[in-house]
């Protein structure tokens, strides 16, 4: 296995600003735990495309953001 | 136009050292991560680390940790290598990638990264 420098986060570099809507299969959150000191929006691409990290700042991981916690709580 | 240019490689003898620079253009290293990789004749590509120069996050393989390390300067939009302890077997071409949107779990896949260098050659002898 690789060695890592610090907690385990999923994503490395700050991602991607944005991802094609029609692209996305879905979106999952990963808030700051013990493990990985920041939050972490990752998109699971349609047709087994893989995975992207998209950038937390960004307008597309923010909206994204708010959708999820408007379901959630 | 996006291009990335190495330079540093060369002739060292076992133990030495080298430091290997990645001088990025047309694009900001803030924006992506950083991948060092290598090649030696007949051999696969291989990954050897990566660096996300936003928050300094490194990734290395297992061939070279504590021997090799990843850094960058963003004022000079150049990312480094520097390698230690050299082996033999770390004889290759060496070529720095920029990749965006990246899994840790993927950053030493070479298929992950968008943009490539043209390489240096680094000869360890013994």
């Known amino acids: 296995f690789p060695m890592f420098k610090r907690g385990r986060c999923l994503c490395i570099g700050p991602g991607v600003k944005a991802v094609k809507v029609a692209d996305i299969e879905k979106a999952s959150i990963m808030y700051p735990s013990n493990n990985c000191d920041k939050i972490e929006v990752i998109i699971t691409l349609k047709e087994n495309k893989g995975q992207r990290c998209l950038n937390p700042k960004s307008k597309q991981a923010r909206l994204i953001i708010k959708k999820v916690e408007r379901k959630n709580f | 136009e996006v291009q990335l240019v190495e330079s540093g490689g060369g002739l060292v003898q076992a133990g030495g050292s080298l430091r290997l620079s990645c001088a990025a253009s047309g694009f900001t290293l803030d924006d992506y991560a950083i991948g060092w990789f290598r090649q030696a004749p007949g051999k696969e590509r291989e990954g050897v680390s990566c660096?996300?120069?936003?928050?300094?996050?490194?990734v290395y393989a297992d061939s070279v940790k504590g021997r090799f390390t990843a850094s960058s300067d963003n004022a000079k939009n150049t990312a480094y290598l520097q390698m230690n302890s050299l082996k033999p077997e770390d004889t290759a071409v060496y070529y720095c990638a920029a990749g965006q949107g990246l899994l840790t779990a993927q950053a030493l896949r070479w298929e992950s990264y968008d943009y490539w260098g043209q390489g240096t050659q680094v000869t360890v002898s013994s």
């Open positions: 660096i996300s120069s936003i928050d300094g996050d490194t």
